[in-house]
Amino acid sequence: KNLKSPQKVEVDIIDDNFILRWNRSDESVGNVTFSFDYQKTGMDNWIKLSGCQNITSTKCNFSSLKLNVYEEIKLRIRAEKENTSSWYEVDSFTPFRKAQIGPPEVHLEAEDKAIVIHISPGTKDSVMWALDGLSFTYSLVIWKNSSGVEERIENIYSRHKIYKLSPETTYCLKVKAALLTSWKIGVYSPVHCIKTTVENELPPPENIEVSVQNQNYVLKWDYTYANMTFQVQWLHAFLKRNPGNHLYKWKQIPDCENVKTTQCVFPQNVFQKGIYLLRVQASDGNNTSFWSEEIKFDTEIQAFLLPPVFNIRSLSDSFHIYIGAPKQSGNTPVIQDYPLIYEIIFWENTSNAERKIIEKKTDVTVPNLKPLTVYCVKARAHTMDEKLNKSSVFSDAVCEKTKPGNTSK
């Protein structure tokens, strides 16, 4: 009886693992083995595919074959018993195009209200991704174990920190890789779960802001307790893409080591032009807080984001505020060619109760004021880019008295 060729050959490539699967053509014939040959583009001769000779099952692994993953290859298969079937040719394919990204390795570290995620490719020193290994981005799905409500986080790099979690709570997550340059989306990792730690005695500093005063940067933050010392560290933002690189080292700002106030001042020349990340940590001598959330700091925007100047026209029940371009030395206006929003704070001179207005326009009305009352106003500018989220310092306060009643027209 003539042996039939096997059919429906499937090639599965995940990272550097090359698997072939096929269907037997004739289930009734026993003791059949299968063998593959391969052929490279532009070659006439067929070569025996090592790892896929005289196979008794319907699956084989040819990962040991050192192929050029960008070069098209063709496969053929036949069945063998006493005689052999005719060859069945598989459509030619390019391994790189066919390959899927395997599940990444994931390592978790817990803080009280945050989880640090370390992600690395599932296959170390992969041949398939040798030219693309630095281009992987990752996405993850995270959920509280008790609720199962999922949150997706896209476009993260191989070290990512998730903040604003609850202490002593189990969170679960899974991660997959993507190579956006090749339109490839990978397979999810197994689910990893971790319990956040008991709440730390010292919370991390919050609301970190950078502003410019004279030739210095002023870094300010909020903290819950008094009598603390703080340290500030910085990192080149582009290194976030590549935390495995030896250059990924958080560095001290010398003028911000062991400061006893919730601000520190350091010269602008500490940073060359670029984008940096900053973080702050608190200590009381015995205990240390976790690091604050990292803020992005762009020297180009920061250097030129000056406080707005404004004029006030006083009426009996309101102020009209006209915001102009900030002045630099020499009294020339600064041209700021990115969209800004303005935060205007005002208060009655005899009170500490502040009110706030946020406006995109440069002419703003402050309503509901009392006649013949002194009110003070200060303003600052914010960039509208959420990621950079830069703010100028507040302008000096300007105080004006409202007019007597019936002058609101």
């Epitope: 040798a130 693309d132 290194l239 690189n245 030896h246 250059l247 560095k251 001290q252």
Partner: antibody, heavy 117, light 107 residues
Framework: EVQLVQSGAEVKKPGESLRISCKGS????????MAWVRQMPGKGLESMGI????????RYSPSFQGHVTISADKSISTAYLQWSSLKASDTAMYYC??????????WGQGTLVTVSS | DIQMTQSPSSLSASLGDRVTITCRAS??????LNWYQQKPGKAPKLLIY???NLASGVPSRFSGSGSGTDFTLTISSLQPEDFATYYC?????????FGQGTKVEIK
């Protein structure tokens, strides 16, 4: 002004030990990697290893691992390269260089080590 | 170790010539690739960092390009002070490694 000042030339016999130094000034010493580079007579540059003085993280090139020791004393802003037993093949010019995201941006003047019986 | 291979290993050129030196890495190094110039008896000098950025004080006739595994240093118009040996260096993997050098000589 950033400066890296290396110790002076050395003439040694095979089997002797040696430590050469590189003192950094004009910058925050602990914020930069320090590299050691060998240049044998008439040859190219060879990376020996690097050290991050802040946490003493040290990485050696495979061909120098076990043959030399790189260390640093951050209290005096100085990095060291040492041999426990010199060989004639260690004869070379040795440079230290400050290393950061912009490459090896400042170099020492070099220390010539001659090993001869 | 990542191997860095420069070509050519030496070249002769005349003043005003455009000179191109290539460097190939055995693995992807992203854009973590630097170029140095060394003159006899002197310490090397950084020319280009992270593939295409001109180091401080380096003339604009020097430029760098490339990413991944293939990189190029170009001198647009060779000057007398440019005759030297040029090295590429990757810093994606620690410790950084150098190419074997390209000697640029006067024709």
């Amino acid at each position: 002004e950033v400066q890296l000042v290396q110790s002076g030339a050395e003439v040694k016999k095979p089997g002797e030990s040696l430590r050469i130094s590189c003192k950094g000034s004009g910058y925050t010493f602990t914020n930069y990697w320090m590299a050691w580079v060998r240049q044998m007579p008439g040859k190219g540059l060879e990376s020996m290893g690097i050290i991050y003085p802040s946490d003493s993280d040290t990485r050696y090139s495979p061909s120098f691992q076990g043959h030399v020791t790189i260390s640093a004393d951050k209290s005096i802003s100085t990095a060291y390269l040492q041999w426990s037993s010199l060989k004639a093949s260690d004869t070379a010019m040795y440079y230290c260089a400050r290393h950061d995201v912009e490459g090896y941006d400042y170099w020492g003047q070099g220390t010539l080590v001659t090993v001869s019986s | 170790d990542i191997q860095m291979t420069q070509s050519p290993s030496s070249l002769s050129a005349s003043l005003g010539d455009r000179v191109t030196i290539t460097c190939r890495a055995s693995q992807n190094v992203g854009n973590y690739l630097n170029w140095y110039q060394q003159k006899p008896g002197k310490a090397p000098k950084l020319l280009i960092y992270r593939a295409s950025n001109l180091a401080s004080g380096v003339p604009s006739r020097f430029s760098g390009s490339g990413s991944g595994t293939d990189f190029t240093l170009t001198i647009s118009s060779l000057q007398p002070e440019d005759f030297a040996t040029y090295y590429c260096q990757q810093m994606e993997h620690a410790p950084p490694t150098f190419g074997q050098g390209t000697k640029v000589e006067i024709k």
